[in-house]
Amino acid sequence: KAMHVAQPAVVLASSRGIASFVCEYASPGKATEVRVTVLRQADSQVTEVCAATYMMGNELTFLDDSICTGTSSGNQVNLTIQGLRAMDTGLYICKVELMYPPPYYLGIGNGTQIYVIDPEPCPDSDF
């Protein structure tokens, strides 16, 4: 079954290559476990950036080598993606699945366009 997922249309990454956005879902069920996946769409290619499964009321746990971190509060997930460079600019889609118990629900957001601008290298100083 479809579930509504909302996320901001545009986010600008910081000069350190960090972008944060909120993914909010309208939960129609009483799930105890939720899976959140961030997908990146660029040039009609869709790739998985990161994913985490969490218990309602608990923290999200991404894999140790993941570029994502996050926290949850009710039906909101605060996602942070790190280590971004200009080449990572693209549409980042939030996918939410109510995993268990049944029934299963799936929601896919419209995506957040994340713009990443590589910082200008500092010019050498002559003293």
């Epitope: 218990m55 995993m99 268990y100 049944p102 029934p103």
Partner: antibody, heavy 116, light 107 residues
């Protein structure tokens, strides 16, 4: 490739105990709910128990509630079913199954025979 | 618990036949209905999930339809390897429950 391998079945007397294990590989084990489903000889499929991906929520069929305990060790990618106070009617092949939208992957099963 | 009733409990058919198996839920389960095939001595295998979605690797001669309480599994042209027992299962409300099975035999 997803693989589920059950072990621990065997012959046990009524009132006895047995612990089944299911070793999983080929997927992110902690992300998925897992279930035990059994099939008595010549009979249909019966759902027995389920556990959420984190292990925080467990569910049981009325027929085994209070006697069976499902658990998982996500660090070992292993699912367990502790079966106590076994009865003749618990005789069956026990399958572990990964549950996503459906039971999309099943183990080969392990036979539990309860008989004196 | 939701009861699942399959019909028929068994049927005889020939290779090439179109076969239809029905499954009825005791209350509405939307589209949370799955179909499995089981051969003797083997584990069940998922064929159709969410009423009509074909599981990866399953031949297109298998199809599913229905929603609410009434569902159908159709094999458009029965092949020798399709002789097996078929089960429906609802995943719309815990606990998961199965139909009693339909055995498809060679005529």
């Amino acid at each position: 490739e997803v693989q589920l391998l059950e072990s621990g079945g065997g012959l046990v007397q009524p009132g006895g105990s047995l612990r089944l294990s299911c070793a999983a590989s080929g997927f992110t084990f902690s992300s998925y709910a897992m279930s035990w489903v059994r099939q008595a000889p010549g009979k249909g499929l019966e759902w027995v128990s389920a556990i959420s991906g984190s292990g925080g929520s467990t569910y049981y069929a009325d027929s085994v509630k209070g006697r069976f305990t499902i658990s998982r060790d996500n660090s070992k990618n292993t699912l367990y079913l502790q079966m106590n106070s076994l009865r003749a009617e618990d005789t069956a092949v026990y399958y572990c199954a990964k549950r996503y939208i459906a039971f999309d992957y099943w183990g080969q099963g392990t036979l539990v025979t309860v008989s004196s | 618990d939701i009861q699942m009733t399959q019909s028929p409990s068994s049927l005889s058919a020939s290779v090439g036949d179109r076969v239809t198996i029905t499954c009825r839920a005791s209350q509405s389960i939307s589209s949370y209905l799955n179909w499995y095939q089981q051969k003797p001595g083997k584990a069940p295998k998922l064929l159709i999930y969410a009423a009509s979605s074909l599981q990866s690797g399953v031949p297109s001669r298998f199809s599913g339809s229905g929603s609410g309480t009434d569902f159908t599994l159709t094999i458009s042209s029965l092949q020798p390897e399709d002789f097996a027992t078929y089960y429906c299962q609802q995943g719309g409300m815990p606990p998961d429950t199965f139909g009693q099975g339909t055995k498809v035999e060679i005529k």
